[in-house]
Amino acid sequence: LKGQEFAPSHQQVYAPLRADGDKPRAHLTVVRQTPTQHFKNQFPALHWEHELGLAFTKNRMNYTNKFLLIPESGDYFIYSQVTFRGMTSECSEIRQAGRPNKPDSITVVITKVTDSYPEPTQLLMGTKSVCEVGSNWFQPIYLGAMFSLQEGDKLMVNVSDISLVDYTKEDKTFFGAFLL
Amino acid sequence: LKGQEFAPSHQQVYAPLRADGDKPRAHLTVVRQTPTQHFKNQFPALHWEHELGLAFTKNRMNYTNKFLLIPESGDYFIYSQVTFRGMTSECSEIRQAGRPNKPDSITVVITKVTDSYPEPTQLLMGTKSVCEVGSNWFQPIYLGAMFSLQEGDKLMVNVSDISLVDYTKEDKTFFGAFLL
Amino acid sequence: LKGQEFAPSHQQVYAPLRADGDKPRAHLTVVRQTPTQHFKNQFPALHWEHELGLAFTKNRMNYTNKFLLIPESGDYFIYSQVTFRGMTSECSEIRQAGRPNKPDSITVVITKVTDSYPEPTQLLMGTKSVCEVGSNWFQPIYLGAMFSLQEGDKLMVNVSDISLVDYTKEDKTFFGAFLL
């Protein structure tokens, strides 16, 4: 019962066929983040809306406790945008002792957690120095790429400073994944 | 005639199978925007090239009058990049009465219009304050995510200021969607 | 033996079906760039890791000599992020003779090379003026879109200044493509 087709010049046997509408998929949208303790030197994870408005999970892709749970092994396209906003950054202040300041920055990391593996894996990182003078600032960081994931892997989005995340609109800050 | 395959441990019936090459797809590229009147407090929509150069529409995905028309229901990945360019921004000017200036900004919105629904839905937004001193500036905003769309839905790209869009090259400003 | 399915109201014949797991795919990650000569007025191409860590190529998608080689014709989603980093840009310095400075900038181009065609085709470009004062700076440029490619086409990523590319982490700078 394996799917068969004619390749350009010969018959070829492929892996079992699969209807696209049945594949695990999720698009999560921002909600206001409740302040929580997080470990020093570890970026906090965002939590997400998974069923209201534009958000959804389908075909066994589940969201629980800040994680997207991967229900089957395969190649997934994973993406996120986080919009940050803040007040004037100090990066252009006069430098002490001739050294440039360490700039303010904003960072988004999409992280994979595998229970059988002790350390999380950083899949994608977007990081940007922020040097805005004289006004409030706001800007997005977008990430997206394809990764081979295993059933049971968990995905989360971590940010450098949860208090700078713009949680006001579901179209500004979001996180998604789909099996290819 | 439903598509069948062996799941890891049991036979499973899926939705009808579908050849990937037959799915609705479009990649549209920038053209110069002719100045046109638009409603106050409403971001103007960009119009696009749909058949020359890198641009194409296929498999019943049609482009007409600034809209991509969705020909069948399903989950689509939708993306756009808009490159903006302008001259020195005023955001670093001395602030009156100790208040920061309202910064200049650039915004891209991918919008869904459903005829049976009175209000357009903002699917994706990228918005960025612009604070550049001493020179002309240019920068892209990229957006992309997956959404469940219905047959007949229409997609457009709106921008905060059409006069700042870099229309010079098809690889700088573009808009696309494809059925997953 | 063509793939068949029931359309909503009538039987329709599609192109041959294809198992998704069999499609050409690649995700390449950054490695340190060895300085090489490149032609004046031509952006240098990055080279990539293709098998260690998060990087992979599969199903006849091969990487060789800075190029991804497209093994079969079809519509591909292509993406890349390049993180740049540098020291203070001079764009806000006092301008000589009242003229604005030409701004510093960073640019990423995803380029297609077709052996039968004399000129490379720029598929995607992300370009950004850099005007940071008082500190070191870093920032990503992300690109992604869908293109119709032919068997034998080659893809590469070019950058405006190879010495500004952040090669330190595989999640910061990457390049990928997959057949839809």
Epitope: - | R32, P35, T36, K40, R85, M87, S163, L164, D166, T168 | -
Partner: antibody, heavy 117, light 107 residues
């Protein structure tokens, strides 16, 4: 630095065709539209039309039937032809760079064209 | 076509004084309005675009305001080199059009 330089005859006879060229230097020619604007003596400015490196043009409808703007990317120059001229076409003709979009941030110094027999 | 009407035709002021120039459009042009300065025998120079954004290299004494149909160019304190003719230009609809100009002269 970006420079624009108009050239062409300063005197044209009525009913003939006015021809001007603008040479551009100091910038990537393909990244912009390039425009022609004119100014009759002692009067205001009038937009004539513009072009990009692919030859796409926009014209003022009031002049469209008589205007042709063309481009030569190999020489970094673009040209204006205005046919069937009359005394009303006497003006200083400027070429200019369109940046960011329908705004003119760099101009040539202008060349006076007089239509007279 | 959209008509732009500038007022006054001539403005007589002394150095150090504040100049306020008006431009009115025959229909809304949103914020798609630019201001230029032109001195005798010279090409126009872009001052303001987007109704209120200063062009690169333009001194802070020049500012623009307005939206829709009514726009203002303000020179906060006139310098000797500011005495010139000023034009507004709309780019909300084709064809692009200019106002007839306001001359700022020394009193």
């Amino acid at each position: 630095e970006l420079q624009l330089q108009e050239s062409g005859p300063g005197l044209v006879k009525p009913s003939e065709t006015l021809s001007l060229t603008c040479a551009v230097s100091g910038v990537s020619f393909t990244d912009y539209h390039w425009a022609w604007i004119r100014q009759p003596p002692g009067k205001g400015l009038e937009w004539i039309g513009d072009i990009n490196h692919r030859g796409h043009t926009n014209y003022n409808p009031s002049l469209k039937s008589r205007v042709t703007v063309s481009i030569d990317t190999s020489k970094n120059q673009f040209s204006l032809k205005l046919s069937s001229v009359t005394a009303a076409d006497t003006a200083v003709y400027y070429c200019a760079r369109d940046y960011p979009n329908f705004i003119y941030d760099y101009w040539g110094q202008g060349t006076l064209v007089t239509v007279s027999s | 076509d959209i008509q732009l009407t500038q007022s006054p035709g001539t403005l007589s002021l002394s150095p150090g004084e504040r100049a306020t120039l008006s431009c009115r459009a025959s229909q809304s042009v949103s914020n798609y309005l630019a201001w230029y300065q032109q001195k005798p025998g010279q090409a126009p120079r872009l001052l303001i675009y987007g109704a209120s954004r200063r062009a690169t290299g333009i001194p802070a004494r020049f500012s623009g305001s307005g939206s829709g149909t009514d726009f203002t160019l303000t020179i906060s304190s006139l310098e000797p080199e500011d005495f010139a003719v000023y034009y507004c230009q709309q780019y909300a609809a084709s064809p692009l059009t200019f106002g007839q100009g306001t001359k700022v002269e020394i009193k």
